[in-house]
């Protein structure tokens, strides 16, 4: 079991993740672990020498880079916010700000846009991952209503008048709640849509 550096005639190395082929000397050398970079290249008699990334820089993977990548903040102008800081082993972790979804993706989200409103009588279908796509509005299920235009409002169950010792004056719809009234009082026309106690 040879340890780097070792000769390789077929230009491949045993451990592709942690070793790389160095064509000048036709040898396999060690890559540097995450959080480090190559400070001295390998030779036939000496393996790669690695050094820790300086503050504000990182390398995420086993590498044979001679520099670390500069940490960059998430861009609030593009609708992004930070969920985790940059460290020597990972870049800054970003996500779309609340009420936004990812509109442009290039290995990671680069641009977020405002979620569309769902009209009354509908709500946004719940997604596995927040911020991944725009709202898909679905009708409120039976017995529920939603009376605003909003990207985030949820359908609520209709009020059950009997639970409050009242009777139904007007049934609920997908866009409005049940109207209740006191069983002893008739509901004047101008009071429709309100709850009389």
């Amino acid at each position: 079991q040879a340890v780097p550096p070792y000769a390789s005639e077929n230009q491949t190395c045993r451990d592709q993740e942690k070793e790389y082929y160095e064509p000048q000397h036709r040898i396999c050398c060690s890559r540097c672990p995450p959080g480090t970079y190559v400070s001295a290249k390998c030779s036939r008699i000496r393996d790669t020498v690695c050094a820790t990334c300086a503050e504000n820089s990182y390398n995420e993977h086993w590498n044979y880079l001679t520099i670390c990548q500069l940490c960059r903040p998430c861009d609030p102008v593009m609708g992004l916010e930070e969920i985790a800081p940059c460290t020597s082993k990972r870049k800054t972790q970003c996500r779309c700000q609340p009420g936004m979804f990812c509109a442009a993706w290039a290995l990671e989200c680069t641009h977020c846009e405002l979620l569309s409103d769902c009209p009354p009588g509908t709500e946004a279908e719940l997604k596995d991952e927040v911020g991944k796509g725009n709202n898909h509005c679905v009708p409120c299920k039976a017995g529920h209503f939603q009376n605003t235009s909003s990207p985030s409002a949820r359908c609520q169950p209709h009020t059950r008048c009997e639970n409050q010792g009242l009777v139904e004056a007007a049934p609920g719809t997908a866009q409005s709640d049940t109207t209740c009234k006191n069983p002893l009082e008739p509901l004047p026309p101008e009071m429709s849509g309100t709850m009389l106690m």
Epitope: N56, P73, D75, P76, A84, P85, T87, S88
Partner: antibody
Framework: QVQLVQSGAEVKKPGESVKVSCKAS????????LHWVRQAPGQGLEWMGW????????QYNEKFKGRVTITADKSTSTAYMELSSLRSEDTAVYYC?????????WGQGTTVTVSS | DIQMTQSPSSLSASVGDRVTITCKAS??????VAWYQQKPGKAPKLLIS???YRYSGVPSRFSGSGSGTDFTLTISSLQPEDFATYFC?????????FGQGTKVEIK
Amino acid sequence: QVQLVQSGAEVKKPGESVKVSCKASGYTFTTYYLHWVRQAPGQGLEWMGWIYPGNGHAQYNEKFKGRVTITADKSTSTAYMELSSLRSEDTAVYYCARSWEGFPYWGQGTTVTVSS
Amino acid sequence: DIQMTQSPSSLSASVGDRVTITCKASQNVGINVAWYQQKPGKAPKLLISSASYRYSGVPSRFSGSGSGTDFTLTISSLQPEDFATYFCQQYDTYPFTFGQGTKVEIK
């Protein structure tokens, strides 16, 4: 060498606001995050939020959202933390700190006392 | 938010003793944990970052270990200047959170 020098102690009444400053030197102010952390008497440490002076963007701990504002003045390499609607529970030492895999650099702390 | 539960809350020890302080995260934080020492009236001082890397100028008697949810700070041979309060902190995700502290007192 990196230095963070904070403004002096403050005594405030409930409902008032306080603004604490943190002057940075010894490094490029615009390329490092500056955080604010507070410590109530005899208590632990509580992270409040950060500012990235390069673009002026700040993010806050939800607990303080709406009450805390962190700003930075690039021309003087100074960060500010303003806390409004003060209550007695806000009596604490407030620290600014520069981050990198933890907080290697801290200000000396500013004592804020809230008392009627 | 991630909770950092530190134990013990206080301990009494003698010069030369080996002291161990533990910190448990409520969810996986990888190795993104720092340890601090704080003396009365002073700002905290960074001892360990990335769970086990000693910060520059920190004596070799301080060591850190752990990953995921369980972390340990060890002082191999307690010195008079080590009597202080120690805090752990996770910087894996926002909001950053700290342990409640361990006060190391003279026996």
